[in-house]
Amino acid sequence: IVLRPSRVHNSEENTMRALTLKDILNGTFSYKTFFPNWISGQEYLHQSADNNIVLYNIETGQSYTILSNRTMKSVNASNYGLSPDRQFVYLESDYSKLWRYSYTATYYIYDLSNGEFVRGNELPRPIQYLCWSPVGSKLAYVYQNNIYLKQRPGDPPFQITFNGRENKIFNGIPDWVYEEEMLATKYALWWSPNGKFLAYAEFNDTDIPVIAYSYYGDEQYPRTINIPYPKAGAKNPVVRIFIIDTTYPAYVGPQEVPVPAMIASSDYYFSWLTWVTDERVCLQWLKRVQNVSVLSICDFREDWQTWDCPKTQEHIEESRTGWAGGFFVSTPVFSYDAISYYKIFSDKDGYKHIHYIKDTVENAIQITSGKWEAINIFRVTQDSLFYSSNEFEEYPGRRNIYRISIGSYPPSKKCVTCHLRKERCQYYTASFSDYAKYYALVCYGPGIPISTLHDGRTDQEIKILEENKELENALKNIQLPKEEIKKLEVDEITLWYKMILPPQFDRSKKYPLLIQVYGGPCSQSVRSVFAVNWISYLASKEGMVIALVDGRGTAFQGDKLLYAVYRKLGVYEVEDQITAVRKFIEMGFIDEKRIAIWGWSYGGYVSSLALASGTGLFKCGIAVAPVSSWEYYASVYTERFMGLPTKDDNLEHYKNSTVMARAEYFRNVDYLLIHGTADDNVHFQNSAQIAKALVNAQVDFQAMWYSDQNHGLSGLSTNHLYTHMTHFLKQCFSLSD
């Protein structure tokens, strides 16, 4: 018998190491997810690690390469798209990022049947957007702000629009504000289900004021970037929706879809388009004052070749306590009768739930209910509706997938994911094949992420698609921080928080506290997800306690909390962070002389206001790319929550809620202000104005700018940023380097 002395165990423990900043910056502990690219009920494509495009057939268990990495490499392709008739693949290369979603690229078409690239009538370059029709192999693409159509890849193109002009008229793609704040896509065109029609948006930005900033590059003179960007209260884009028959595009040309009268009477937005059938389309519109949304169902009139949107098919959604919807107005999921639909909106108790609308919104049948929220409808089949919610065990920061049987009465509900890997997996999303024959579950945590494949009928797990084994092994000798998610009850408000604690945390000791805040309307920071990031390192190596708190204005806990910030941004979000800090101090393990706060974007705004709150709670803090005045931010986002900056509306609070107005209060804190000079989203102007106000008030502060960097501060700037912030915090907390 060999006795193992206990010191062997100790020496094993000694091999455990803390996270380093280098680990984080190198992405050493990043995870992988697996989202199948479904092409039928039982087949999906996946780009393998060695860049082959592989088709997997779930039922045969077979896989084969449909496009080799050699072909991909021949045009330096990084992405692909198979035509629905499976004859062609577009290959995407020369990716060039524009804004958050948009990019341009070069496209090549590969003919699978003939094993060669399509020559003749090649696509122009660079293309702003390209997509296959849902059936066959028609192509629609946007080039120089105009839309083109090809009946077959080798055919000459048919030009649909002619008025496209840079920064003036956008066809089939959104302008800056629609991309970022309304559609959240790089495209603004939609094929009908069988490819008969193509709908598209035209955005006219002619009268929009332009934001201009220098891009320094490395030429003798900097370039000026000009973007039509409507700030709060400014002139907005004018949107029109057109539909063209793609079989006979020249016959009557594009037909405009009428805007509902109650919408067209004042400034408005188009918010989304959903095809129901080839001859029925659903458009959603929103008043500029975003508490009224209209869903309009339109039908094709063969005799007139026009689109008719009867008033009887208009459904109004209105909020009396805030804005319409959550972050966006939800989109409908139509049922098989092609007229009734399922949609998430607030119930009478102020919780967002699934409703079934057959004739009028007033007669909607509520499908889910409770003091929790339905978050996303994934799929509706003949007999099931799949959705996600945060119902399980009353944790708002979880996501589980549920199935409601709609084919039987009364409908029965089953949680598909709640008990699968309960400790590891509490935050899921899903991806469904045609007819929900199979689906993939992607679990984001709190344990190491895992992606699995399931039978859509029985919910049985078929196989693991990605389990991040390498990551699991790499983490075996790492001292990760402990995480806990709990709640504080304060004055009838529930404040959920996540606390990240050093590995050897001892409640009897005192630790420096860093608050990480975002806090924007309809956001959620306290989520049961896996992450090894900068704050993990700060807890693991530097011995800090980090806390994230979801205060008023955050999402998925009902309208009372969500709409509390309506027309009053910058007040309750800050109050709730401060309240939480006071509660954390009461817990006894926080060194109240070493408390900091940091945030990015909206979080930079909140952290700045918290530092300038005059409470004396914070020793120091960091604002990265902060908003400093709501007059400087985008109309669509800002006015949703703040109304208009006019005397007869909400100008007073626009003025009261600036960071600059509190410049004096920064005198007793150490403030680090950081911004990219080429930030197209939260303009550098915001930080320039903070700096000017602080200088004018003769308040000392630290600052860092990142030349030619946007809102994401990516690439080498990321390393510099986190290194710089680490030094700042360690100095603030008197931690040795």
Epitope: S40, G41, E43, L55, E59, T60, Y64, R86, L112, G115
Partner: nanobody, 115 residues
């Protein structure tokens, strides 16, 4: 290894019909997506019709409801019923996986439509 053998072609008058067959030697699962393709000499091979393991079908625009793709899982067979044939349907017809695999093109079966 699977080999695909096509048959059933021939000479037919305009408006006439044919039934093409494709039999797989070796085990071919009924869950495989399969398709019929055709090629006119000097032109590119093109899809005629495809069928998934789940029975979903896809037809080229030129088919216009004249052809029907089907399969017989028991016999390991894939079929294409050609009705209302036109002179422009004259071509060599091939079966293959859907999307096609470069190593699986057979000899094909010739269909000639002429009066």
């Amino acid at each position: 290894d699977v080999q695909l053998v096509e048959s059933g072609g021939g000479l037919v008058q305009p408006g006439g019909s044919l039934r093409l067959s494709c039999v797989a030697s070796g085990r071919l699962s009924s869950s495989n997506s399969m398709a019929w393709y055709r090629q006119v000499p000097g032109k590119r091979r093109e899809l005629v019709a495809g069928i998934t393991g789940g029975g979903e079908t896809n037809y080229a625009d030129f088919v216009g409801g004249r052809f029907t793709i089907s399969r017989d899982n028991a016999k390991n067979g894939l079929y294409l019923q050609l009705n209302g044939l036109k002179p422009e349907d004259t071509a060599a017809y091939y079966c293959n996986f859907w999307p096609p695999l470069i190593n699986y093109w057979g000899q094909g079966t010739q269909v000639t439509v002429s009066s």
